[in-house]
């Protein structure tokens, strides 16, 4: 079996993470994503996922979670809005492909929220406003929850993660403030 | 109309192990949009999640079951079945199956039950 | 494990009034990143399988009625009848899922 292996992330509370996760466009590109988080010897909790179909560069919020599906880049891109020390843990996105089983789209983010200043401003309410949130009737119907089980047959492809304000533009290569640190299962 | 039903013997000897097993009719087990998981209910007592497991085999237990529990999925047959080993009159239980939504635990769907006894 | 503790343990209400059972976790069921309680309220009748009311602390289930309606956040959380009817006579038990998954022990439900 291929091994999994996590990129680990050490952000301050109040920064924002930005992770593009690639999918392969032509097979994928409308099928609803997703993102979860994954806590030891539990099952993997879907926190937030796009529509069915997803929509091309329309963002969906969830509380602090935004995700934003580009077709044209073959990319979802996932934000986490002013990071809480609680935020810590394990996420990965996935593809929902019922009836076969979802497919992770990348290695796993190891998120470490730490207290202390944060270099870039902290996001608020306001800097969200332009995204469609998700109203608080949501039902099952909005977010059908299709498992993602722990077990990978082929290697998923990488990912690249920003700290910036939520309302920044797609950057797949300003990496700031961030320390990556592989880890290998 | 999807619906569970769970099976097994009725009286367990202490020491020996639990077996049952739930089908799954109306529906196919091998649904990616959820779990299949057991939860017990002793006698005039409260409901305890002994664990539950995907049609590809991932499995998540209690802790405090963990080491005694095995749950396995035959997708042929549409079952999944539970065994719990070295049991003990404390294990006296009804117990369920149920149908548990992905990535929020809850369990929207529940078999009626069966009484397992464990005594000598 | 996260402890659900559940009060009353009984409780009798006439027929049309209100219910009131009160579910505290011991630790938050809260996620702040998406903002949902992961916590469920279940209805069991004597001789029944539990049933499914409401989810993410206030989402009724397909199909119950409106009467029943859950509210509360982070530890502290109610599930309202709001006028009880002679088939809502059962005891109710809160679930979370958050870390791990646990019951709290139940409130009986009876008519007064």
């Known amino acids: 079996a291929t091994k999994l292996t996590e990129e680990k992330y050490e952000l301050k509370e109040g920064q924002t993470l930005d992770v593009k996760c690639d999918y392969t466009l032509e097979k994928f590109a409308s099928s609803q994503k997703a993102w979860q988080i994954i806590r030891d010897g539990e099952m993997p909790k879907t926190l937030a996922c796009t529509e069915r179909p997803s929509k091309n560069s329309h963002p969906v919020q969830v509380g602090r979670i935004i995700l934003e599906d580009y077709h044209d880049h073959g990319l979802l891109r996932v934000r986490m809005v002013n990071l809480q020390v609680e935020d810590s843990g394990l996420y990965q996105c996935v593809i929902y492909q019922p009836p076969k089983e979802p497919h992770m789209l990348f290695d796993r983010i190891r998120l470490v929220v730490t207290k202390g200043f944060s270099g870039t401003p902290g996001s608020n309410e306001n800097s969200t406003q332009n995204v469609y949130k998700i109203p608080p009737t949501t039902t099952k119907a909005l977010c059908p929850l299709y498992t993602s089980p722990r077990t990978v047959t082929q290697a998923p492809p990488k990912s690249t993660a920003d700290v910036s304000t939520p309302d920044s533009e797609i950057n797949l290569t300003n990496v700031t403030d961030i320390i990556r640190v592989p880890v290998f299962n | 109309q999807l619906q569970l039903q769970e099976s097994g013997p009725g009286l367990v000897k202490p020491s020996e192990t639990l077996s049952l097993t739930c089908t799954v009719s109306?529906?196919?087990?091998?649904?990616?949009?959820?779990?299949w998981g057991w939860i017990r209910q002793p006698p005039g007592k409260g409901l305890e999640w002994i664990g539950s497991?995907?049609?590809?085999?991932?499995?998540y237990y209690n802790p405090s079951l963990k080491s005694r529990v095995t749950i396995s999925v035959d997708t042929s047959k549409n079952q999944f079945s539970l065994k719990l080993s070295s049991v003990t009159a404390a294990d006296t239980a009804v117990y369920y199956c149920?149908?548990?939504?992905?990535?929020?635990?809850?369990?929207?769907?529940w078999g009626r039950g069966t009484l397992v006894t464990v005594s000598s | 494990d996260i402890v659900m503790t559940q009060s009353p343990d009984s409780l009798a209400v006439s027929l049309g009034e209100r219910a009131t059972i009160n579910c505290k976790s011991s630790?938050?069921?809260?996620?702040?990143?998406?903002?949902?309680?992961?916590l469920a309220w279940y209805q069991q009748k004597p001789g029944q399988p539990p049933k499914l009311l409401i989810y993410?602390?206030?989402t009724r289930e397909s199909g119950v009625p409106d009467r029943f309606s859950g509210s509360g956040s982070g530890t502290d959380f109610t599930l309202t009848i709001s006028s009880l009817q002679a088939e809502d006579v059962a005891v109710y038990y809160c679930?979370?899922?958050?870390?791990?998954?646990?019951f709290g022990g139940g409130t009986k439900v009876e008519i007064k």
């Open positions: 497991i995907y049609y590809s085999g991932s499995t």
């Open positions: 109306g529906g196919s087990i091998s649904s990616s949009s959820y779990y």
């Open positions: 630790q938050s069921v809260l996620f702040s990143s998406n903002n949902k309680n992961y």
């Open positions: 149920a149908r548990q939504e992905y990535g929020d635990g809850y369990f929207d769907l």
């Open positions: 679930q979370q899922d958050a870390t791990g998954i646990t």
């Open positions: 993410w602390a206030s």
